[in-house]
């Protein structure tokens, strides 16, 4: 994948629906100038072309949604990085500016006379991409144009400014909501004192200086906060670890509001460094309960805990997509590339044969081995279900009466659909109701997940409480298995009696040492000490002065 | 600062047990290491045992060496020395609670596996 | 893992030598070198590769990145007399030896 020749997935239809998914992975640091992409992708590319295909089907076989009108699609690959993304932004854009000159499917030559070419339909919205930064760039491109478009996994909180993203909505929560969730993790647990890693970019940003922002409110200190890129090397991995180390044993529970990605480098690095079991990861949705990111490096992701956007498998999605195979899938240009990398073999005689790999395809293959759907396939096909209502309900308003596209609703007017997009109601895939807010976001519902060894060299992850609404469930015993076990990461223990917290110039409000009153002094506050007045005496507790009663001495006294 | 003892001569194939005694300093805040060196020879690091219990070894020495620790000493066992363990073992803090910089070393304790 | 040259060097009184310390893959800096004088613990002189350990005076000067470090000793004096180290302060894992062979400096 190179930026000289780009694949697109086509399906045709009445309404053209663009779509960026991250097909493949993104280009690693020294390929990023000439935008070649990385090796295919199956939760967040395959599966999401697959849902998209699979979902306008359904849609289109729906009588009760759009009738007589059939949605298709242009699907490109953004490959999870904002040149990509953007490029192929600029071919939807082009699409549309070219069809905007036409005159019933005419293109006017330059000469006035006209041409029977017909050019492509114009794009009337996006769904995706996956990744905030990378989503944040396309929207200020779509915008322009007035296409809106409809985000399945971008949560940065900057996304719900309208005033600078207008044409954004998304069928997730904003970023501020699992900021406040790992708030509250923390707090939970009586973690006074954490390190913070972020990936670079908006969404590892933003959500980090919420949580940062929420935890000096709360009273929890941040021992140090580093930022690295998703796609950084070796190195750059290992000085953060060894950074971290530094922070040890007070900060032992590392906040990541991270890419996958990242915490997978984190991991990596880990086991270079000999770090397993040193920390506790406290992950974002990046992470969730993505095994791509802990396979191989099960040891250090232990113990992890991560929050995960609700959204239940689909199975529909599973019966449609575990049937499908290279012989007959051809509408997914990049199907047969994906196949080949799956199952490490070649296929023979096929138009993409990857000569790389040394072992043939057998028939006998299936993707049905060691399935996983993507974590955000609800959300994925949400999004393509609330283009659709939107549409629907916009037809239903421009063309009363009317079965298909009306010519009021010709050429359609992303200003309207926008409009249209944003009263939107429908009950999801899921059950659960998908609406809009005033800033296009969706309600925030969280389950807690915790990585944990099930079994000798079974690893797996556990729902272990959810956060919804602002209210968090933990099941603790089964985080933790007794009380005993729950990790400390605090910088300094409470003082004893009698004792105050001297805090050391520079030093977080977390970080003190303890330093014991003076013989006539009292604790009046945990940060000073004061003197008892004359004729009084600190009493047992050290908290406040006592009246030395009055002995009078007489003659025959001992001495004192 | 950390001393150790236990250095004395054994016969090969005999265990034997090093300690490490700390002062001044938690077991719980930073990590503990062995190092050693033969008789007119270079530097050779052994293992450590973590501020957190974790313990890592130089290939070499996994399955010859265990280290251990309580609140206040670090034990070094040899399982079945053999004469080219004959050397000083040094104990050394290290500068963090895990891997990093040595940067307190003890005397050192001479060991000497004769038959 | 570490591997450490020139193995012995004679150096006049107020010269100047240079020990090289190679690694076998990138330790970012992560290195330290440590002075050792017959019967006595080895001392810290450098950290970080180039981060001048407290007490040690300023003739002492590391550099380096990635797989090469070097320490450089100027205005020899007689007390400079002794066997230097490197180590590599990146990784418990998968490690042969963290120290370098050594170098004995003798000042004439």
């Known amino acids: 994948q190179s930026s000289e020749r780009r694949v697109v997935a086509h399906m045709p239809g009445d309404i053209i629906i663009g779509a960026l998914f991250s097909v493949h992975h993104q280009p690693t640091v020294d390929k990023v100038h000439e935008r070649k992409c990385g090796a295919v992708r199956e939760q967040y590319g395959i599966q999401r072309v697959e849902a998209m295909l699979h979902t306008l089907e359904r849609i289109n076989s729906d009588p009760t949604l759009l009738p007589n009108i059939t949605l298709g699609c242009e699907i490109r690959d953004s490959c999870w990085h904002s040149a990509v993304a953007l490029e192929q932004s600029i071919e939807f854009i082009r699409d549309s500016l070219i069809s905007s000159e036409e005159e019933e499917g005419l293109v006017r030559c330059v000469d006035g006379s006209s041409s029977s070419f017909r050019s492509k339909k114009p794009i009337v919205g996006v769904i995706g991409p996956g990744s905030s930064s990378v989503a944040i760039q396309v929207q200020n491109l779509l915008q322009l144009f007035n296409i809106p478009q409809i985000a399945y996994s971008a949560t940065s909180m900057d996304l719900s400014d309208k005033t600078l993203f207008k044409y954004f909505m998304r069928v997730v929560p904003s970023d501020a909501q699992q900021a406040r969730a790992m708030v509250d993790i923390v707090k939970r647990y009586n973690w006074t004192y954490v390190s913070a890693v972020h990936t670079e970019g908006n969404y590892g940003e933003s959500g980090m200086e919420a949580f940062k922002d929420m935890s000096a409110k709360e009273g929890i200190c941040i021992a140090h906060s580093y930022k690295i890129y998703s796609n950084a090397g070796e190195q750059s991995f290992d000085k953060l670890l060894k950074k971290l180390t530094s922070h040890l044993p007070k900060a032992r529970v590392v906040a990541c509001f991270c890419e996958g990605m990242t915490v997978r480098g984190l991991l990596m690095a880990m086991r270079r460094l000999g770090l397993a079991g040193e920390f506790l990861l406290l992950g974002s949705d990046g992470w969730a309960d993505r095994y791509d990111v802990t396979d191989g490096y099960q040891r250090e992701a232990v113990g992890g805990i991560t929050i995960k956007l609700q959204s239940p498998d689909v199975k529909w999605f599973d019966d449609y997509y575990l049937k499908l195979r290279p012989e007959t899938n051809h509408r997914n240009p990049w199907f047969q590339e994906f196949w080949q990398h799956r199952f490490q073999c070649r296929l023979e005689g096929f138009p993409q044969e990857n000569s790389k790999y040394n072992k043939t395809c057998n028939s006998s293959l299936t993707l049905k081995t060691h399935h996983v759907q993507d974590s955000k396939m609800g959300f994925v096909i949400n999004a393509i279900y609330s283009m659709a209502y939107g549409l629907h309900n916009m037809q239903m308003s421009l063309c009363p009466g009317y079965a298909g596209l009306c010519d009021a609703m010709k050429p359609i007017d992303g200003r309207k659909l926008l409009e249209s997009l944003m009263k939107t109601n429908f009950t999801g895939v899921s059950g659960d109701t998908i609406l809009f807010d005033e800033n296009g976001d969706s309600p925030g519902r969280y389950e807690i997940m915790n990585f944990k060894e099930m079994g000798k060299d079974y690893f797996d992850y556990i729902n272990v409480g959810s956060w919804d609404n602002g209210e968090l469930k933990m099941d603790d015993d089964e985080v933790w298995s007794k009380k005993s076990n729950i990790i400390r990461s605090v910088c300094s223990e409470p003082c004893e009696k009698g004792q105050i917290k001297v805090i050391r110039k520079g030093e977080v409000s977390c970080c003190w040492t303890c330093t014991p009153c003076k013989e006539n002094e009292y604790v009046f506050d945990e940060y000073t000490c004061k003197a008892c007045q004359l004729g009084s005496w600190p009493t047992d507790d050290l908290t406040g002065c006592d009246l030395i009663p009055v002995q009078y001495l007489r003659w025959g006294d001992p001495e004192p | 600062s950390v001393e150790e003892s236990g250095g004395r001569l054994v016969t090969p194939g005999t265990p034997l047990t090093l300690t490490c005694t700390v002062s001044?300093?938690?077991?719980?805040?930073?990590?503990l290491n062995w190092v050693r060196q033969a008789p007119g020879k270079g530097l050779e690091w052994i293992g450590i045992?973590?501020?957190?219990?974790s313990t890592y070894y130089a290939n070499w020495a996994k399955g010859r060496f265990t280290i251990s620790k309580t609140s206040t000493t670090v034990d070094l066992k040899m399982t079945s020395p053999t004469t080219e363990d004959t050397a000083t073992y040094f104990c050394?803090?290290?500068?963090?609670?895990?891997?990093?910089?040595?940067?307190?070393w003890g005397p050192g304790t001479l060991v000497t596996v004769s038959s | 893992d570490m591997t450490q040259t020139p193995a012995s060097v004679e150096v006049a009184v107020g010269g100047t030598v240079t020990i090289k310390c190679q690694a076998s893959?990138?330790?970012?800096?992560?290195l330290a070198w440590y002075q050792q004088k017959p019967g006595q613990p080895p001392r810290l002189l450098i950290y970080?590769?180039?981060n001048l350990a407290s007490g040690v005076p300023s003739r002492f000067k590391g550099s380096g990145s990635g797989t090469e470090y070097t320490l450089t000793i100027s205005d020899l004096e007689c007390a400079d007399a002794a066997t230097y180290y490197c180590?590599?302060?990146?990784?418990?894992?998968?490690?042969?030896?963290?120290f370098g062979g050594g170098t004995e400096v003798v000042v004439k």
């Open positions: 001044g300093f938690s077991l719980s805040d930073y990590g």
């Open positions: 893959q990138s330790i970012s800096s992560y």
């Open positions: 970080g590769a180039s």
């Open positions: 180590q590599q302060a990146l990784s418990p894992s998968n490690v042969d030896n963290a």
């Open positions: 050394v803090r290290d500068s963090s609670a895990t891997y990093d910089y040595f940067n307190l």
């Open positions: 045992i973590y501020a957190s219990g």
